[in-house]
Interface confidence: low
């Protein structure tokens, strides 16, 4: 998602299960640290971004015609896992310790 | 990038190589359809925007904390190489058949 | 009121076993996690192993493949069998209870037991 | 595995005295950090878990604050039965493990 004048860069985000309606299946943990990847993608776009090449010609589009084409966006570029315990099909507590996909681990500019 | 209406899709962008000033090392072609990601990432996420579980998460946030957090955004999910034919170090002309990373295939919500 | 009774410490040489026992009581015993925390004479607390309410197990890298954590919820005892003991394993050992079915933190400890490894 | 370092190791402070012990995880281990209280030949107390949660029965005078990989246990006026060792311990991910020890002495 994208933020103000900040560059690209991971923020915390505190997600309570009962907030997004997943406290009905998920036991544990109550809330979790999602992050967020917040800032803009400037240019020139920095290595820590890890920028593709499209990331870097839509950058330099942008600069040309800013009103044709947007700026890249800072998104997740790498996921890590959390462990949870949740209610399977049969309502059993049952504890996954790599729930893929949940939490940001990096940003970067796409 | 992130749009206005319409729900997360692939739009053509044409780059003309002289506009971004690559046209200095790339003979050919002047020009290709880089493709965009342009479109808002809205509830429910649709499986054709191939959502992560992070951008699920983010999504239900900013349903209830829309000032809060951001929608997740629509960016290039795999990308295409084009051919090119380029001045090398020594300045002579070499062809690249995949240079990788140029063109969006796929779009969806991170 | 819930209450943890530690037992089965005492003297055993290198190489020897023991299975240490913990009595719960006062609180439904098969929805926590118990753990078994040391202290060596003079030192800190370690965490030694825990078994979930669902079942799973994990232990500190330096008791694996020679301590066992199991419980037995019909009559609400938490147990942990002592292979192959060293020097230093010597030291009290505590019963505790998670406040919760998963990892978390240690609400109620026992009065400890002491395992002494010396021959 | 996730350390946990405590500081200071050791403090003399006098009885009224506001006090703070600092505790830093290696690793985000977000608000699941806990505090305990050991006094000689007793069990360890559970004082505060989850950073800041003041657990039943536990006086107002301790405090928790923190989130992340910095956490600090806060006594702010300290009593004669406050003179203990206190030891952090995080709950976000097994292992668990424990900081040090921060014993605290009379002045």
């Known amino acids: 998602s994208t933020g103000a004048s900040s560059h690209c860069q991971k923020t915390s985000l505190r997600v309570n299960f009962e907030d997004i309606g997943w406290d009905s299946w998920i036991i544990a943990p109550k809330e979790y640290d999602a992050y967020e990847c917040k800032g803009g993608c400037f240019f020139p776009l920095a290595d820590d971004v890890t920028p593709t090449k499209h990331a870097i010609v839509q950058t330099l589009v942008h600069l040309k015609f800013p009103t044709k084409v947007g700026k890249a966006c800072c998104v997740p570029t790498k996921l890590s896992p959390i462990s949870i315990l949740y209610k399977d099909d049969m309502g059993v507590p049952t504890l996954k310790y790599h729930y893929e996909g949940m939490s940001v681990a990096e940003c970067g500019c796409r | 990038s992130t749009g206005a209406s319409s729900h997360c899709q692939k739009t053509s962008l044409r780059v003309n190589f002289e506009d971004i000033g690559w046209d200095s090392w790339i003979i050919a072609p002047k020009e290709y359809d880089a493709y965009e990601c342009k479109g808002g990432c809205f509830f429910p996420l649709a499986d054709d925007v191939t959502p992560t579980k992070h951008a699920i998460v983010q999504t239900l946030v900013h349903l209830k904390f829309p000032t809060k957090v951001g929608k997740a955004c629509c960016v290039p999910t795999k990308l295409s190489p084009i051919s090119i034919l380029y001045k090398d170090d020594m300045g002579v002309p070499t062809l690249k058949y995949h240079y990788e990373g140029m063109s969006v295939a796929e779009c969806g919500c991170r | 009121q819930v209450q943890l009774l530690e037992s089965g410490g005492g003297l055993v040489q290198p190489g020897g076993s023991l299975r240490l026992s913990c009595a719960a009581s006062g609180f439904t015993f098969s929805s926590y996690a118990m753990s078994w925390v040391r202290q060596a004479p003079g030192k800190g607390l370690e965490w030694v192993s825990i078994t979930l309410g669902t079942g799973h197990t994990h232990y500190a890298d330096s008791v694996k493949g020679r301590f066992t954590i199991s419980r037995d919820n019909s009559k609400n005892t938490l147990y942990l069998q002592m292979n192959s003991l060293r020097a230093e394993d010597t030291a009290v050992y505590y019963c505790a209870r998670g406040s919760y079915i998963i990892w978390s933190a240690l609400d109620y400890w026992g009065q400890g037991t002491l395992v002494t490894v010396s021959s | 595995d996730i350390q946990m370092t405590q500081s200071p190791s050791s403090l003399s402070a006098s009885v009224g005295d506001r006090v703070t012990i600092t505790c830093r995880a290696s690793?985000?281990?977000?608000?699941?950090l806990n505090w305990y209280q050991q006094k000689p030949g007793k069990a360890p107390k559970l004082l505060i878990y989850d950073a800041s949660n003041l657990q039943s029965g536990v006086p107002s005078r301790f405090s928790g604050s923190g989130s992340g990989t910095d956490f600090t246990l806060t006594i702010s006026s300290l009593q004669p039965e406050d003179f203990a060792t206190y030891y952090c311990?995080?709950?976000?991910?097994?292992?668990?493990?424990f900081g040090q020890g921060t014993k605290v002495e009379i002045k």
């Open positions: 690793q985000d281990i977000r608000s699941y």
């Open positions: 311990q995080q709950s976000d991910t097994s292992p668990l493990t």
